[in-house]
Interface confidence: low
Amino acid sequence: SGVFQLQLQEFINERGVLASGRPCEPGCRTFFRVCLKHFQAVVSPGPCTFGTVSTPVLGTNSFAVRDDSSGGGRNPLQLPFNFTWPGTFSLIIEAWHAPGDDLRPEALPPDALISKIAIQGSLAVGQNWLLDEQTSTLTRLRYSYRVICSDNYYGDNCSRLCKKRNDHFGHYVCQPDGNLSCLPGWTGEYCQQPICLSGCHEQNGYCSKPAECLCRPGWQGRLCNECIPHNGCRHGTCSTPWQCTCDEGWGGLFCDQDLNYCTHHSPCKNGATCSNSGQRSYTCTCRPGYTGVDCELELSECDSNPCRNGGSCKDQEDGYHCLCPPGYYGLHCEHSTLSCADSPCFNGGSCRERNQGANYACECPPNFTGSNCEKKVDRCTSNPCANGGQCLNRGPSRMCRCRPGFTGTYCELHVSDCARNPCAHGGTCHDLENGLMCTCPAGFSGRRCEVRTSIDACASSPCFNRATCYTDLSTDTFVCNCPYGFVGSRCEFPVGLPPSFPW
């Protein structure tokens, strides 16, 4: 990088005329356009590949140009370049007449040109000015030029850059000879490579700044020595990245199927015994005196309706006591002093004599029970609904309203989405609370194992630079574990110029 400097010194246009020979009115208000470009044996139009610069109006007809700012323009004129100076150049200097204040090319008539000079040749970098003078029939231009290096550039071609910096492109200061000296924590030819946190795993970690430890895909922890389980893994661990090895009592591809509800949730109350009966399913066996799906309800001794023949039950500290209606006696009012002649059967019950009329029995119509058909049948008393189903009396019958996931007259059947064998190609079906999941055999994928895939994503050796390849069996994709000094999804990038990582 450097600057081509052009010092305009004197312009002579004694007759005050344009290139066409036409005189300027009132005089030639002269400004210059400069085009610097690559060497051409014959200088021709085309891009000013090294740069362009224009001056303001510097004078009228003939004038000398001062060595400092003049009307807002600089002298010498600066044409900076940001490449290695090739040592050769072409230079076009045009003198133009400005009738008005607008100096833009499109604002000037094409015949406003006063003169045009074009030179080409060799030019070495240096402090010394080359003086030149170009004369045409009507004008003369005296000028000098040179090429110097920009600050922080050195060498015959201004190609040796050394500028202290502390950014993405390097972290160094410059030595007197232009060589680099790395800042603490940085290494490498251009001091771009950070020295990572001590102990950072050399395969699984890397860093973008000193004393840092960033983990490659599949690894975590302060030193990147802990693997990351598969995305979605709930109750599982890994020994290499993207595994999901289930903890005790859990199952399924993501270890999210509870195979031990009893242990994990202890749902049975009041000392009941819990038995696992499938995924998220259990049965509580209640101790005497308790009832309910989770044995959460304490039974009253009267709850079992021990008093017969319309006797009323009273709870007592040491048990219960039956108050018998007229005509009955006994602990449970089970003995009668009545006969069929006393019409003891209620609610349309039929009376049948027994023991030669000393006793009787009532035959009750549907929906009634008891020795005298005095009780309306409550078909829910015996808690016939399994798996937490709710019992409902419906006239002469009862029905069970089942919890989600259960069916059958008594909610005794677990609803199975797997019953219709939805998993293709020998996939294993798992019932979930809200549906099902297929675990596919090797070589198949998709929600129902319907997609045939390659069995081993690593078979094609997709990883570069001797990286280790892991196959993610749940998605049939691969993960590359890069050796030290390489990054990227396939370990294709050297760490020296880290790309922007997608993780």
Epitope: H38, Q40, G46, P47, C48, T49, P105, P110
Partner: antibody, heavy 119, light 108 residues
Framework: QVQLVQSGPEVKKPGASVKVSCKAS????????ISWIRQTPGQGLEWMGW????????DYAQKFQDRITMTTDTSSTTAYMELRSLRSDDTAVYYC????????????WGQGTLVTVSS | EIVLTQSPGTLSLSPGDRATLSCRAS???????LAWYQQKPGQAPRLLIY???NRATGIPDRFTGSGSGTDFTLTISRLEPEDFAVYFC?????????FGQGTKVEIK
């Protein structure tokens, strides 16, 4: 909008000349140059040269230097490209495209003119 | 003359895929002088990218140009059906101005 409209297809015999026109509209014609590019199945896209509508200066590719002439008519905002001593390998679609010295690209392009050279 | 070599010659991809086209110059080219064009059958080329990385007016932001020196890249982040075409790079730093031989992006 900026538009370049070219003349129609031409069929020529070897040794003849062809002159293709390119009518510009939608911008100040003299602020830009016109480049000519041809496309042959064998050679792909090939730049032939350009002309400044501002001052008429031209820059021809050396390959065509001795048999090409580019001109402009600022009054009708039209550019012309004449190619002489035609050969069969000059069969191509010839495009004009707007170009400016400080914008180093071609935009827009004309629709193209097919020139067929055949005996 | 500067030779621009484009690779690959043909790219077979599906809609939604990412396309990466390369243009390598036989010698260093200032980025300001490198452009990319798209051409569909029976049509003139259309400017996509100028100055190596600037999108032309009306060009969607899925088109990105990058690079400097001798290596330049055109990236199409997600291919749309209308993007299947031939793409050319072009330099105007040194005369004669030259084009690459083109990369055809076709539907797989």
């Amino acid at each position: 909008q900026v538009q370049l409209v070219q003349s129609g297809p031409e069929v020529k015999k070897p040794g003849a000349s062809v002159k293709v026109s390119c009518k510009a509209s939608g911008y100040t014609f003299t602020y830009y140059g016109i480049s000519w590019i041809r496309q042959t199945p064998g050679q792909g896209l090939e730049w032939m040269g350009w002309i400044s509508a501002y001052d008429g200066n031209t820059d021809y590719a050396q390959k065509f230097q001795d048999r090409i002439t580019m001109t402009t008519d600022t009054s009708s905002t039209t550019a012309y490209m004449e190619l002489r001593s035609l050969r069969s390998d000059d069969t191509a679609v010839y495009y004009c495209a707007r170009y400016s010295w400080n914008k180093h690209w071609f935009d827009p392009w004309g629709q193209g003119t097919l020139v067929t050279v055949s005996s | 003359e500067i030779v621009l070599t484009q690779s690959p010659g043909t790219l077979s991809l599906s809609p939604g895929d990412r396309a990466t086209l390369s243009c390598r110059a036989s010698q260093s080219v200032t980025g300001s002088y490198l452009a990319w064009y798209q051409q569909k059958p029976g049509q003139a080329p259309r400017l996509l990218i100028y100055g190596a990385s600037n999108r032309a007016t009306g060009i969607p932001d899925r088109f990105t140009g990058s690079g400097s020196g001798t290596d330049f890249t055109l990236t199409i982040s997600r291919l749309e059906p209308e993007d299947f075409a031939v793409y050319f790079c072009q330099q105007s730093a040194f005369s004669p101005w030259t084009f690459g031989q083109g990369t055809k992006v076709e539907i797989k």
